[in-house]
């Protein structure tokens, strides 16, 4: 009886098991009982990343500089191009189809996790004893100045946006 299922890396056509084309190659013609599957290498800027019976290769992804993209890894006949973002930007999706500027942490907030090529900045509110007075994508919350260690006293309390103001101790006359 003709086969109803085929081995791995084969496909069933016309009651016959034919070899799939290897990654990096596309199908030109199905096998017969006299000749094997005919496959051809993908062209320049094309790829196929699996054993396949595709008649067309896929185009490599284009890393559009107008969208802030650059090539992280050049594609081959078996792999797609991997795009990443230019310095100071991160991908807006898993497939990195566009980029966005890293979000700065506003005053009162500090950087908990720096942005990467794939993730945005993670900010957190400065807790008591810490402040941030700048809008920055890399500055953490800074601890208030310790007036005591400088033999000074607090003249103005700190907030999450401002440091304490130290001053000299009043002398008893």
């Amino acid at each position: 009886e003709p086969p109803t299922a085929c081995r791995e890396k084969q496909y069933l056509i016309n009651s016959q098991c034919c070899s799939l084309c290897q990654p990096g190659q596309k199908l030109v013609s199905d096998c017969t009982e006299f000749t094997e599957t005919e496959c051809l290498p993908c062209g320049e800027s094309e790829f196929l990343d699996t054993w396949n019976r595709e008649t067309h290769c896929h185009q490599h992804k284009y890393c559009d500089p107008n969208l802030g993209l650059r090539v992280q890894q050049k594609g081959t006949s078996e792999t797609d191009t991997i795009c990443t973002c230019k310095e100071g930007q991160h991908c807006t999706s898993k497939d990195c189809e566009a980029c966005a500027q890293h979000t700065p942490c506003i005053p009162g907030f500090g950087v908990m996790e720096m942005a990467t090529e794939t993730t945005d900045t993670v900010c957190h509110p400065c807790p008591v004893g810490f402040f941030s007075n700048v809008s920055s994508a890399f500055e953490k919350c800074h601890p208030w100045t310790s007036c005591e260690t400088k033999d000074l006293v607090v003249q103005q309390a700190g907030t999450n946006k401002t440091d304490v103001v130290c001053g000299p101790q009043d002398r008893l006359r």
């Epitope: 003709p2 016309n14 009651s15 016959q16 013609s29 017969t32 009982e33 006299f34 000749t35 094997e36 005919e38």
Partner: antibody, heavy 117, light 107 residues
Framework: EVQLLESGGGLVQPGGSLRLSCAAS????????MSWVRQAPGKGLEWVSG????????YYADSVKGRFTISRDNSKNTLYLQMNSLRAEDTAVYYC??????????WGQGTLVTVSS | DIQMTQSPSSLSASVGDRVTITCRAS??????LNWYQQKPGKAPKLLIY???SLQSGVPSRFSGSGSGTDFTLTISSLQPEDFATYYC?????????FGQGTKLEIK
């Protein structure tokens, strides 16, 4: 024991016709692809035509396309080659062969076709 | 059609010799190549299939190698019964095609 026995060869004039037969025995004929291969006197081998198993497709060398027709009768365990519009360059020993995994593992003894006026 | 070119066309050797016959395809055929032996007045016999697999019943002194466009048939130690004509045959593209043959003669 696998056996393939060709018949039907002979002398024919250019433009004439001939039908070759190949009687198969010793195996399940319908389960195998079959082919015809020829060899001109003192020359090499030339694949002529093939027919798939289970009533599969038919395939021809460009040199015989449109003139030769391969067929099979699974009930009679017989392979045929109908040859029309014969030319002097078709003169050869014609072998039938059984196919398995893209190779011809059993061959007949051949039958001589001579095209001459 | 794919052209198959064998070399040499003829070869003289002695019993016990190691012999290599080459076959070149006009384009890549992966490992889709068979080797046949033919003795005068007889039908061809399949020796090697898929470039390097030995057909059942064929002595182990026969071996095949190669892929892409260049292939070789090697007989490690010639026996008297090995003097014959050898053909390569590709099955990577329709139609299947044979090399022109290599005639192996006794020196």
């Amino acid at each position: 024991e696998v056996q393939l026995l060709e018949s039907g060869g002979g002398l024919v004039q250019p433009g004439g016709s001939l039908r070759l037969s190949c009687a198969a025995s010793g195996f399940t004929f319908s389960s195998y692809a079959m082919s015809w291969v020829r060899q001109a006197p003192g020359k090499g081998l030339e694949w002529v035509s093939g027919i798939g198993s289970y009533g599969g497709g038919t395939y021809y060398a460009d040199s015989v396309k449109g003139r030769f027709t391969i067929s099979r009768d699974n009930s009679k365990n017989t392979l045929y080659l109908q040859m029309n519009s014969l030319r002097a360059e078709d003169t050869a020993v014609y072998y039938c062969a059984r196919y398995v995994n893209f190779g011809m593992d059993y061959w007949g003894q051949g039958t001589l076709v001579t095209v001459s006026s | 059609d794919i052209q198959m070119t064998q070399s040499p066309s003829s070869l003289s050797a002695s019993v016990g010799d190691r012999v290599t016959i080459t076959c070149r395809a006009s384009q890549s055929i992966s490992s889709y190549l068979n080797w046949y032996q033919q003795k005068p007045g007889k039908a061809p016999k399949l020796l090697i299939y898929a470039a390097s697999s030995l057909q059942s019943g064929v002595p182990s002194r026969f071996s095949g190698s190669g892929s892409g466009t260049d292939f070789t048939l090697t007989i490690s130690s010639l026996q008297p019964e090995d003097f014959a004509t050898y053909y390569c045959q590709q099955y990577g593209r329709n139609p299947p095609t044979f090399g022109q043959g290599t005639k192996l003669e006794i020196k």
